[in-house]
Interface confidence: low
Amino acid sequence: LEDCAQEQMRLRAQVRLLETRVKQQQVKIKQLLQENEVQFLDKGDENTVIDLGSKRQYADCSEIFNDGYKLSGFYKIKPLQSPAEFSVYCDMSDGGGWTVIQRRSDGSENFNRGWKDYENGFGNFVQKHGEYWLGNKNLHFLTTQEDYTLKIDLADFEKNSRYAQYKNFKVGDEKNFYELNIGEYSGTAGDSLAGNFHPEVQWWASHQRMKFSTWDRDHDNYEGNCAEEDQSGWWFNRCHSANLNGVYYSGPYTAKTDNGIVWYTWHGWWYSLKSVVMKIRPNDFIPNVI
């Protein structure tokens, strides 16, 4: 009997080992399939969303990453409250699982748009470096299903890059005009969103708890219209110390005013940045490494 029990334990352990190996193989197969797909895409056809089949619906890119899909690209997600799924770029580098909510790279998209466009989202949802805004509605659906960290990757025209990260990034609903809420800052670019860098400007430059404004829907704290003056939609105060949806200028100091892509604590108001990626991931995200 003792021998029998030991044999059972040995067999159970072997089964577990085999299960783990099968899982590892499944992950490898998924990765190879994706790599094959991406090699195909790299041959010229970037205009494809990676199809995960109807296996399940993913609430964000972290779930896709944890399900073994380790390749960056466009995927379809459906946050819990969202009525429909939508395409989004998933950044599977930098620890993986990042849902990209905004990208600026080359000025190919017009970011001087009205309320409806910013609400629903706009831009290039097919090309790797395509510029887009995911949409305030989608940001609300995403950030209310759990607590998210926002990471902002910034690059200037001198090949320097910095980042800013905020815990507990939340976007309110339509009734609250998609109000911005951010938590604790960390990073290398300075805290331009909360305006904590300078006691004099915080009352008018902080974006914390600001409602979203566009040229046709003015919710800022300025006697003029920030969105109209800065030609973009953003969580304007009076007006900004950060504006990542600003006018794209093809050079650092070509802006005639502070309406460029601005992150004050890095390069000041009159330097327009070369590229920006805004991406989110659950606060408690842990990569599922098998």
Epitope: F197, H198, E200, Y222, E223, E229, R238, K256, T257, W269
Partner: antibody, heavy 115, light 107 residues
Amino acid sequence: EVQLQQSGPELEKPGASVKMSCKASGYTFTRYWMHWVKQRPGQGLEWIGMIDPSDSYTSYNQKFKGKATLTVDTSSSTAYMQLSSLTSEDSAVYYCTLRPGLDYWGQGTTLTVSS
Amino acid sequence: DIVMTQSQKFMSTSVGDRVSVTCKASQNVGTNVAWYQQKPGQSPKALIYSASYRYSGVPDRFTGSGSGTDFTLTISNVQSEDLAEYFCQQYNSYPLTFGGGTKLEIK
């Protein structure tokens, strides 16, 4: 490009008043507070006060209350500083400067008070 | 008022050297300190804000450090064009106050 263009040098007699200007360009004038700083020859810098161009709210260094008066004309994007009851102690270079961090400065207006 | 003290009025250095300009606040100002460079006959130019952040276009040989009451501007690999007066300034509370300045002389 942001520019703060200040008016030319002034020579005044003791007891008189003077009004100097600072014309701003390259940004939305009503957005950012304008500060004024005094520098006497061979001496350090002294903050005089600031004005919010959007509503003309002012804040002064106690030392310059009654001496300096800050105003703006938003239609011409120009800030002004008037100094009254001039004495030789007021002879200095006066700068207008944009905050925060006083990162943009005018070229300065030299005031000489002499009988 | 917060008093900003730059104890050294003059500092002498040679091209290629490293020099540190110090500034002491009479009370805690956090990191709300800026540094300015003023060359003869010119307006001051902002170098550093928030104690350690360089403004755009400022060479990386200029480094700011410190918090609370003690602050330092370090210029490594001093160049002849660094001949100037350097001022610290606090913007933690009003009135804003400046240090008395430190003149850097190149031997």
